[in-house]
């Protein structure tokens, strides 16, 4: 059920229409139970949850990652630079959530939902931004190249890319989360 | 099974700095979503939140006793810490640690260490 | 800071009776609303958490609902276990803060 389309809403036609940043909350915590229901599939099928062989394999990623000085976290929270780095991070994070689309067997809808919905959420964060022409947009010429060396990794190391990407978006959300809460 | 437990002194005198370990294990403090928090309570009273940091580092604290007050982590060895510098008789209270650890970071507690009483 | 308001500051029933008590938020903090019991002489136990979401092992006696800024606590059948005092706490964004509390006397 995508957000803001739940039984409590209907149930309840008292309540006020979500507000922008209600909005942006209930669809990061809807993207974050599909990163959930992928991360069982990912777990199920393979020991990569345990797997302590991480670092080899994060070597060749470079997913977006909160830093002090992003602007995100509470010494030195700075609005402005925390949005153009949470709505950069998923611009970039998108070319890894084309990756994972046909990583999955039985959820497989579910990581298009999840790849459909963080678009989604890009667009609301854009609106709130002021300062847009402060974020980059990744280069698609690199990011087909990235994904053409991605999908030619052998059985092992896509299955711990898979699980490292799913493990930083989730951390890269939750991150967000708590920053935009403090918006 | 998740516990913590507050370790510290027991009495302080006015003006000294109270240091509190909070002491745990059955999770990780590296776990993305997790977070350690302080809350104290006077005697007959009720809770005030103090202060609290994440896996990532990040901390918060209660704007009314931000000046006086420190926390940190220790992943390897399982520990957070709070400082509260110049102490006075009304700081007399009960401090407990609490873990928070959801997805969606409702920061709920939903496990409390047994509170040490400091006077 | 969102100031959490709770109501009554105590209430008195009897076993298999059934309660219902209040928490505002000043302002409004969707479903980020958490509620507690403590025992006196013992640590708060989470009973709720999300506005309605029941903490594992806490019986379906208990049953939180509320959104936006009006929240309530239901015990129904109440059990000598459930005195003392409950607390709700905002969870929307730091700082926390807590209500007051609601003294419970079976």
């Known amino acids: 059920v995508p957000p803001g389309e739940d039984s409590k809403d209907v149930a309840a036609p008292h309540r006020q229409p979500l507000t922008s940043s209600e909005r942006i909350d209930k669809q990061i915590r809807y993207i974050l139970d599909g990163i959930s229901a992928l991360r069982k599939e990912t777990c199920n099928k393979s020991n990569m949850c345990e797997s302590s062989k991480e670092a080899l394999a994060e070597n060749n990623l470079n997913l977006p990652k909160m830093a002090e000085k992003d602007g995100c976290f509470q010494s030195g929270f700075n609005e402005e630079t925390c949005l153009v780095k949470i709505i950069t991070g998923l611009l970039e994070f998108e070319v890894y959530l084309e990756y994972l689309q046909n990583r999955f067997e039985s959820s497989e809808e579910q990581a298009r939902a999840v790849q459909m919905s963080t678009k989604v959420l890009i667009q609301f964060l854009q609106k709130k931004a002021k300062n847009l022409d402060a974020i980059t947009t990744p280069d698609p010429t690199t990011n087909a190249s990235l994904l053409t060396k991605l999908q030619a990794q052998n059985q092992w190391l896509q299955d711990m890319t898979t699980h490292l990407i799913l493990r930083s978006f989730k951390e890269f959300l939750q991150s967000s989360l708590r920053a935009l809460r403090q918006m | 099974q998740v516990t913590l437990k507050e370790s510290g002194p027991t009495l302080v005198k006015p003006t000294q700095t109270l240091t509190l370990t909070c002491s745990f294990s059955?999770?990780?403090?590296?776990?993305?979503?997790?977070?350690v928090g302080w809350v104290r309570q006077p005697p007959g009273k009720a809770l005030e939140w103090l202060a609290f940091?994440?896996?990532?580092?990040?901390?918060y604290y209660s704007p009314s006793l931000e000046s006086r007050l420190t926390i940190t982590k220790d992943t390897s060895k399982n520990q957070v810490v709070l400082t509260m510098t110049n102490m006075d008789p009304v700081d007399t209270a009960t401090y407990y640690c609490?873990?928070?650890?959801?997805?969606?970071?409702?920061?709920?507690?939903?496990?409390w260490g047994q509170g040490t009483l400091v006077t | 800071d969102i100031q959490m308001t709770q109501s009554p500051s105590s209430l008195s029933a009897f076993v298999g009776d059934g309660v219902t008590m209040t928490c505002w938020a000043s302002?409004?903090?969707?479903?980020?609303l958490n509620w507690y019991h403590q025992r006196p002489g013992e640590a708060p136990e989470l009973l709720v958490f999300a506005a309605s979401n029941l903490q594992i092992g806490v019986p379906s006696r208990f049953r939180g609902s509320g959104s936006e800024t009006y929240f309530t606590l239901t015990i129904n059948s109440l059990q000598p276990e459930d005195s003392g005092t409950y607390f709700c706490q905002h969870g929307h964004s730091f700082p926390l803060t807590f209500g007051g509390g609601t003294k419970l006397e079976i």
């Open positions: 302002q409004s903090i969707n479903d980020y």
């Open positions: 609490a873990r928070s650890a959801d997805d969606y970071l409702y920061y709920s507690f939903d496990t």
């Open positions: 940091i994440w896996w990532d580092d990040d901390k």
């Open positions: 059955g999770f990780s403090l590296s776990t993305s979503g997790v977070g």
